[in-house]
Interface confidence: low
Amino acid sequence: GSGVFQLQLQEFINERGVLASGRPCEPGCRTFFRVCLKHFQAVVSPGPCTFGTVSTPVLGTNSFAVRDDSSGGGRNPLQLPFNFTWPGTFSLIIEAWHAPGDDLRPEALPPDALISKIAIQGSLAVGQNWLLDEQTSTLTRLRYSYRVICSDNYYGDNCSRLCKKRNDHFGHYVCQPDGNLSCLPGWTGEYCQQPICLSGCHEQNGYCSKPAECLCRPGWQGRLCNECIPHNGCRHGTCSTPWQCTCDEGWGGLFCDQDLNYCTHHSPCKNGATCSNSGQRSYTCTCRPGYTGVDCELELSECDSNPCRNGGSCKDQEDGYHCLCPPGYYGLHCEHSTLSCADSPCFNGGSCRERNQGANYACECPPNFTGSNCEKKVD
């Protein structure tokens, strides 16, 4: 039901131990009560107990107090549940009866077993407060209180609003006195089904399935899901949106793994050579004099080119080389001769001719011999 009318019997006084007829009970009035709750009537009249009825066992004899069982067992207060919107008005009939035996059914009692009957009617709002009442007749007095409260999960002024607290997939809330939902900490939304994510979790790129969580959508990472994930394999690049690979300066290629500035990153040229980038991972070294090789890593010997002529011998020096000329020759490369044909400079049968430019003579060598003086045998 949506609510319950509660009637708390407190004390019944029947000092003389008599019935409504005035006849005394023998040996005393073993008293029980019948309660009828119905719709509002200006004059409470017999008829159906439209809101419910309840009877008690024998509570005592003649005059007695009734124990308060407010723990909710249903004994006292008496419970009259209803499953409709409480109208705010009612009629109540309380009858006290004498039970000569153990059978309390109406048909088992003599009609004159009635001790007293009271009837009240009026307005009654839903609430926790008890209304205390006392009804007195010439022979009896009944002290009682009553109220209407909503059943579990029903709320509002008329117990018409159903609200069941829950903490599961369908919602995380408790119910306010008016029946509105009050979300549990960490939850939001109309039915408190949406978790409140970790503070700062990116609205678009992050989400959560429970409070204070921040799970990243594909392509995003970081505690707050505000860092994009670059293209898989991106080596020297960054992203502004997921799966991008925007190359850092000096890098190229799909994965930014191709070095466009090899000279700066690797300094491949040795011995003071000048480096020039010439494409992805390619460069050119311009060697200083005296060096050779791709990276100018090899020191050059200038005597290797046999610069000395006329049998001159070559000696390497820090700043180059030096030719030691045989007798009769001079010059940087021993290219100048002090001899003439008269000095018979040609060996091995070579014939001498006089010359005017540079050298003083020239030898014409026979077969199998060469050199400026035909001094070398050809193998």
């Epitope: 066992p57 509570l59 107090a65 009734v66 124990r67 407010s70 067992g73 006292n76």
Partner: antibody, heavy 118, light 107 residues
């Protein structure tokens, strides 16, 4: 004739469990409440708890709350006292009694002895 | 919880004596008090309920009185079968509580 008959008592070790039964006859079981009352050897009476067999509503003494459970089977007119996590101080004769609406015990069973000891 | 304090805890009396046992509640319990008699090895028996009402089948020499916090059980003329332990009980509110008992012995 109103009758209440308890059974199920015996010796049990501390921490153990036991279930007592109270078979009722001679009155309308669902119209009355059934209480359990215990009496330690040489001591006074202590109310343990009560059940309304009709609705299943129960109440318990603080000393047994959370350890003892009272239930009823209306088809058998029998009330039960399930006792778990028993302690030496639970040693007593256990009575079931008819608890009339005023809270008085007008009919009692003969009692059953529960001894909790290692 | 409401405490019920009985006095005396024991008494010796002779057959024919008038015996009075008192019970004091720690707070007002109106007239929601009962008295029980218990003999060794037996279950208690209801004597008086609602403070002063004699339970069916109980001899008229037993009577009860009082309201609020002070209650009395009186046996007007003690009989041999009345030697037993007597307990008061309140059922006004909260858990039902008993007095500690009064043992009536033969003098």
């Amino acid at each position: 004739e109103v009758q209440l008959v308890e059974s199920g008592g015996g010796l049990v070790q501390p921490g153990g469990s036991l279930r007592l039964s109270c078979a009722a006859s001679g009155f309308t079981f669902t119209d009355n409440w059934i209480s359990w009352v215990r009496q330690a050897p040489g001591k006074g009476l202590e109310w343990v708890g009560v059940i309304n067999p009709n609705s299943g509503a129960t109440e318990y003494a603080d000393s047994v709350k959370g350890r003892f459970t009272i239930s009823a089977d209306t088809s058998k007119n029998t009330a039960y006292l399930q006792m778990n996590s028993l302690r030496a101080e639970d040693t007593a004769v256990y009575y079931c009694a008819r608890d009339n609406f005023g809270g008085y015990f007008d009919y009692w069973g003969q009692g059953t002895l529960v001894t909790v000891s290692s | 919880d409401i405490q019920m304090t009985q006095s005396p805890s024991s008494l010796s009396a002779s057959v024919g004596d008038r015996v009075t046992i008192t019970c004091r509640a720690s707070q007002d319990v109106s007239t929601a008090v009962a008295w029980y008699q218990q003999k060794p090895g037996k279950a208690p028996k209801l004597l008086i309920y609602s403070a002063s009402f004699l339970y069916s089948g109980v001899p008229s020499r037993f009577s009860g009185s009082g309201s609020g916090t002070d209650f009395t059980l009186t046996i007007s003329s003690l009989q041999p079968e009345d030697f037993a332990t007597y307990y008061c009980q309140q059922s006004y509110n909260g858990p039902s509580t008993f007095g500690q008992g009064t043992k009536v012995e033969i003098k």
